[in-house]
Amino acid sequence: ATKLTEEKYELKEGQTLDVKCDYTLEKFASSQKAWQIIRDGEMPKTLACTERPSKNSHPVQVGRIILEDYHDHGLLRVRMVNLQVEDSGLYQCVIYQPPKEPHMLFDRIRLVVTKGFSGTPGSNENSTQNVYKIPPTTTKALCPLYTSPRTVTQAPPKSTADVSTPDSEINLTNVTDIIRVPVFN
């Protein structure tokens, strides 16, 4: 079995998680991709997904989650803005490839969000500009509801330094509403 590795991200409330998930562009450029949370002993839960087929560089926003799929680069960018303590947990990027199982990209992400705003936009940002242009249009999410039972695994044991995932759901706005953020030319 493939060893599932975790990458730990420690951020403060209000900061932005910014993850780059690489993929083989020749194989997966237009495939639908998703951001999932994994709770111990449960099936991964899809929080946001790209369109099907995935549109090049068009941001999709679901609540505080923004997905940007860069076909030209083989890169899915995932941002979770205005992080809250209850966002702490284990996440993963996946590619949907029905009828096969979803293909996991990158390491799983162990996100630990602590109290106390740091005063910076994000732990890995030094942006001179950081403006998100979000138009008022919304549309229904088309994320597949299935997850292969074989992907249900007991999550790797947490280190003692990790913060446990809370029982409460992630505090997102209506996950069925996707805001399409156009690229401004």
Epitope: E7, K8, K20, D22, Y23, N56, S57, Y70, D72, H73, G74, L75, F106, D107, S123, N124, E125, N126, S127, T128, Q129, N130, V131, Y132, K133, V183, F184, N185
Partner: antibody, heavy 116, light 107 residues
Framework: EVQLVESGGGLVQPGGSLRLSCAAS????????MSWVRQAPGKGLDWVAS????????YYVESVKGRFTISRDNAKNSLHLQMNSLRAEDTAVYYC?????????WGQGTLVTVSS | EIVMTQSPATLSVSPGERATLSCRAS??????LAWYQQKSGQAPRLLIY???IRATGIPARFSGSGSGTEFTLTISSLQSEDFAVYYC?????????FGGGTKVEIK
Amino acid sequence: EVQLVESGGGLVQPGGSLRLSCAASGFTFSSNWMSWVRQAPGKGLDWVASIKQDASEIYYVESVKGRFTISRDNAKNSLHLQMNSLRAEDTAVYYCVRGGWRFESWGQGTLVTVSS
Amino acid sequence: EIVMTQSPATLSVSPGERATLSCRASQSVSSNLAWYQQKSGQAPRLLIYGASIRATGIPARFSGSGSGTEFTLTISSLQSEDFAVYYCQQYKNWPLTFGGGTKVEIK
């Protein structure tokens, strides 16, 4: 075929200014992050700045913040780097590159020499 | 800032032999690592991204491995056109940073 052609380099005195330009073709410019990377003579590579498709996110290396400004014109498929208050240590070949994090395509570079 | 350190600075290899280049990050960059090749007088070229994914058009003799802080670029059988300088680069965090390079020269 992706083509990135830089222009605007040259010799400038310390404290002076230069504006570099990059003409892009062969790909959808408006869908791509773009960046500038530089290389001092005989040295390694140094990232300078990156700009998102709609310029809503811009990042700079600390040493050029407040002196350099990256910009783009999607209608003209062009990328720019306005360089002010130039220093001797800014002397380098400046490459226009496609990508905001890693760099898939590179121009041939334009040499900027800062010297009195 | 994440500091990238490459070793060795120079690697002398005979054509047909295997070359192994190392790159170390001062903190974890997960798999957000790229490798570039730069021949004398030319612009760099992307070889590997995501630590192990070959870029479009790159021959199979180039392979990347590693995750976290330790990475390796392997050229399985060096061809004459492979003698060049190789750079690693992390893109997990801003600022984006490159290693100092490894020059692969003919032994």
